[in-house]
């Protein structure tokens, strides 16, 4: 009896694991083995696929084959007993295109009201993702073990901290990876659970803000108790993307070590241009708080988000305001290459009733003014990026009198 070729061959690639599955064509024939050949693009000869020769089951693993994952390959399979079936050719494929991202490895650390999630690729030193290691982003689903209400968090990197949790509570989460450049979404990790600790005696500092004064940065925060000492640390923000490395080398800000006030001042030249994370910790000499929430700090935005400069053209019933780039010392304009929104506040000089206009444009009309009346105007700039939500201080108020009636043409 002629052996029939196997059918429905499926190629599953997860990370660097290459698995083949197929159906037997004839279940009634026993002791059949199966063998695969492969062919690379541009080659005429077929090569035996190691790991997939004389297989008795309907599954084999050819992960040991060192393939160029960006190169198209073709497979064929046949059944063997005393004689052999004809070859069944599988549609050619490119391993990288076919590959799925496997479940990432997840490690958890618990605090009283926070969990730190360390994520690394499931396959260490993967060949499949060798060129994409730094491009992985992750998303996670987290829930309280007791409630099951899920919260999704998208676009996180290899270290992520979730705040505002409840003490002594078990949280569960699962994580999956994505390579957005290749439109690939991975499979979820197994569920990991961890219990937050008892509430710490000292809470972490809150509401950390950075501002610029002269040539210095001023870092301020709030704290519940008096007579504390604080320390501040920084980290390059890009280091949170570092896959597989669980050591984050937070550095002290020298002028912010063991400070006894809820603020510290340090020179702008402490930081080169870049995006940093900052965190603050409190201590009373015996106990130490956990670290505060980490805030993102962009030196370019921080240093150069100066109040806008503007000119006013006065009409009888309106002001035309022309916003220009703020001036640095030396009267050179600051180039701000990120989108800004302008907040303009104006009021009648004899009144405290302020009105507000929010505008993206740099020429703004303030309407519905009374003729021959003194109005004052001040303005500030906001960044449009919600992750780097920064605002300049207000400009000094400029007061102008509107023109007499009928000059609005």
């Amino acid at each position: 009896k002629n052996l029939k070729s196997p059918q429905k061959v499926e190629v599953d690639i997860i990370d660097d694991n290459f698995i083949l599955r197929w159906n037997r064509s004839d279940e009634s024939v026993g002791n059949v083995t199966f063998s695969f050949d492969y062919q690379k693009t541009g080659m005429d000869n077929w090569i035996k696929l190691s790991g997939c020769q004389n297989i008795t089951s309907t599954k084999c693993n050819f992960s040991s084959l060192k393939l160029n994952v960006y190169e198209e390959i073709k497979l064929r399979i046949r059944a063997e007993k005393e004689n052999t079936s004809s070859w069944y050719e599988v549609d050619s494929f490119t391993p990288f295109r076919k590959a799925q991202i496997g479940p990432p490895e997840v490690h958890l650390e618990a605090e009283d009201k926070a969990i730190v999630i360390h994520i690394s690729p499931g396959t260490k030193d993967s060949v499949m993702w060798a060129l994409d290691g730094l491009s992985f982003t992750y998303s996670l689903v987290i829930w309280k073990n007791s409630s099951g209400v899920e919260e999704r968090i998208e676009n996180i990197y290899s270290r992520h901290k979730i705040y505002k949790l409840s003490p002594e509570t078990t949280y569960c989460l699962k994580v999956k990876a994505a390579l957005l450049t290749s439109w690939k979404i991975g499979v979820y990790s197994p569920v990991h659970c961890i219990k937050t600790t008892v509430e710490n005696e000292l809470p972490p500092p809150e509401n950390i803000e950075v501002s610029v004064q002269n040539q210095n940065y001023v870092l301020k925060w709030d704290y519940t108790y008096a007579n504390m000492t604080f320390q501040v640390q920084w980290l390059h923000a890009f280091l949170k993307r570092n896959p597989g490395n669980h050591l984050y080398k937070w550095k002290q800000i020298p002028d912010c070590e063991n400070v006894k006030t809820t603020q510290c001042v340090f020179p702008q030249n402490v930081f080169q241009k870049g995006i940093y994370l900052l965190r603050v910790q409190a201590s009373d000499g015996n106990n130490t708080s956990f670290w505060s929430e980490e805030i993102k700090f962009d030196t370019e935005i921080q240093a150069f988000l100066l109040p806008p400069v503007f000119n006013i053209r006065s009409l009888s019933d309106s002001f035309h305001i022309y916003i220009g780039a703020p001036k640095q010392s030396g009267n050179t304009p600051v180039i701000q290459d990120y989108p800004l929104i302008y907040e303009i506040i104006f009021w009648e000089n004899t009144s405290n009733a302020e009105r507000k206009i929010i505008e993206k444009k740099t020429d703004v009309t303030v309407p519905n003014l009374k003729p021959l009346t003194v109005y004052c105007v001040k303005a500030r700039a906001h960044t449009m990026d919600e992750k780097l939500n920064k605002s300049s201080v207000f400009s000094d108020a400029v007061c102008e009198k509107t023109k007499p009636g009928n000059t609005s043409k």
Epitope: H107, D112, T197, N200, L247, Y248, T288
Partner: antibody, heavy 118, light 107 residues
Framework: EVQLQQSGAELVKPGASVKLSCTAS????????IHWVKQRTEQGLEWIGR????????KYAPKFQGKATITADTSSNTAYLQLSSLTSEDTAVYYC???????????WGQGTSVTVSS | DIVMTQSQKFMSTSVGDRVSVTCKAS??????VAWYQQKPGQSPKALIY???YRYSGVPDRFTGSGSGTDFTLTISNVQSEDLAEYFC?????????FGGGTKLEIK
């Protein structure tokens, strides 16, 4: 294979100084912290301090401030512990260990025995 | 400084038994606790990090648990080669500190 190879045993006189070395293989010390730990005979482990070999930043236990100086040479992938003004209290085995953050001190050297005696 | 207290200096157990070594921190250290095993005449060997994660190559009869201030290393199905001293360590705050150690004796 990750290894930390420490320098040989030292017999030194009171008041003198000694410099111990810890040479790493199988990894780059710049990617980790290197810690030093003291253990006196039949006693527990005492943390001395650590260095970030990338920039030389150090942290010390208050007890060892002024006694211990930790340095590193990234070109030879080696960390050092210098102990000064030695007394019999400094007689101990000193270990270096690699520290990987979350993963703590995952690899240890074999230890260097320091004996302070006149 | 954070004090790590291993109240039992010695523990006696038999092959095949289950034993728990405890460690108490003087303040909340989250889950930043590691356990090390030191056999006579050898350097310490890392067993557990981040309270409950085993290093690769460590037999699964070693498990870590706890959080905050109370931590436990459990050895189930104790083997003769587990005769050693066990140290806990916190690495949440500088200076990092070790427990005094618990010596495991095999009956």
């Amino acid at each position: 294979e990750v290894q930390l190879q420490q320098s040989g045993a030292e017999l030194v006189k009171p008041g003198a100084s000694v410099k111990l070395s810890c040479t790493a293989s199988g990894f780059n010390i710049k990617d980790y912290y290197i810690h030093w730990v003291k253990q006196r005979t039949e006693q527990g482990l005492e943390w001395i301090g650590r260095i970030d070999p990338e920039d030389g930043e150090t942290k010390y236990a208050p007890k060892f401030q002024g006694k211990a100086t930790i340095t590193a040479d990234t070109s030879s992938n080696t960390a050092y512990l210098q102990l000064s003004s030695l007394t019999s209290e400094d007689t101990a085995v000193y270990y270096c260990a690699r520290f990987g953050g979350l993963t703590a001190m995952d690899y240890w050297g074999q230890g260097t025995s320091v004996t302070v005696s006149s | 400084d954070i004090v790590m207290t291993q109240s039992q200096k010695f523990m006696s157990t038999s092959v095949g038994d289950r034993v728990s070594v405890t460690c108490k921190a003087s303040q909340n250290v989250g889950t930043n606790v590691a356990w090390y095993q030191q056999k006579p005449g050898q350097s310490p060997k890392a067993l557990i990090y981040a309270t409950s994660y085993r290093y690769s190559g460590v037999p699964d009869r070693f498990t870590g648990s706890g959080s905050g201030t109370d931590f436990t290393l459990t050895i189930s199905n104790v083997q003769s080669e587990d005769l050693a001293e066990y140290f806990c360590q916190q690495y949440n705050n500088y200076p990092y500190t070790f427990g005094g150690g618990t010596k495991l004796e095999i009956k």
